[in-house]
Amino acid sequence: QGWQAFKNDATEIIPELGEYPEPPPELENNKTMNRAENGGRPPHHPFETKDVSEYSCRELHFTRYVTDGPCRSAKPVTELVCSGQCGPARLLPNAIGRGKWWRPSGPDFRCIPDRYRAQRVQLLCPGGEAPRARKVRLVASCKCKRLTRFHNQSELKDFGTEAARPQKGRKPRPRARSAKANQAELENAY
């Protein structure tokens, strides 16, 4: 009883986990990236810096149960939503700041998943169906990456020292988590 009340958290169920991280799908209605709304970028900011360690992006966490159709994980999970922009760490006091966000005057920086953690979860199903195990991939940390304009902002460049390596032998797979689902989780996290 109570199974019908579950909302589908659209968790990505993964048959096989690759070795390298990959960027998430774009969030819809991401107002933090709307330059016009925020009045564009100032020509200079006193806190501008090229030191990688000075940059930070906000990590919003959430907690949920993994669902797959009518089945639900025995234990809940927690993971991150990497939100929007990057800026100097000293301007992002608690990782979750309110008010205006600092913008660099050079290339755009985006906060994206850095490290994923593979977790095996046990799914419990209604109607006496046997429990089944699934692997899920959860976002464990975020980092800043630079978007280059040369590739129509499609190429993400590592802001850290090590560039993202190509994903060899990885078959493309449909992503179960929709942008809408991501956005809902993001709004929930505020």
Partner: nanobody, 118 residues
């Protein structure tokens, strides 16, 4: 392994308030998240909300947003759940649990009963 002990539950009238505590002993890491969960009679356990141990980032289920507040005191290794404007549907056993970011909640407390009468 972390040991978790909840306290502060009890019987309260609708519209009233309660404050639950969850005391943690054992290891805690900066990437840990502590969560509150509840289970009503005959229902499955559900998420109430959670808080990161380091940054103080909080997450709330829609059903409690604006009424419940999660906080923590790192010096005391304790997390709190301030519950205001309680409703009969908030009745249940409240559990706290801990997880590392990007993983499952594996360590659980024994729970504390909250009953909201109409």
């Amino acid at each position: 392994e972390v040991q978790l002990v909840e306290s502060g539950g009890g019987l309260v009238q609708a519209g009233g308030s309660l404050r639950l505590s969850c005391a943690a002993s054992g290891r805690t890491f900066s990437r840990d998240v502590m969560g509150w969960f509840r289970q009503a009679p005959g229902k499955v356990r559900e998420v109430v909300g959670s808080i990161t141990w380091s940054g103080g980032s909080t997450y709330y289920a829609d059903s409690v947003k604006g009424r419940f507040t999660i906080s923590r005191d790192n010096a005391k290794n304790t997390m709190y759940l301030q519950m205001n404007s309680l409703k009969p549907e908030d009745t249940g056993v409240y559990y706290c649990a801990v997880a590392e970011l990007g993983s499952t909640y594996n360590d659980w407390g024994q729970g504390t009963q909250v009953t909201v009468s109409s």
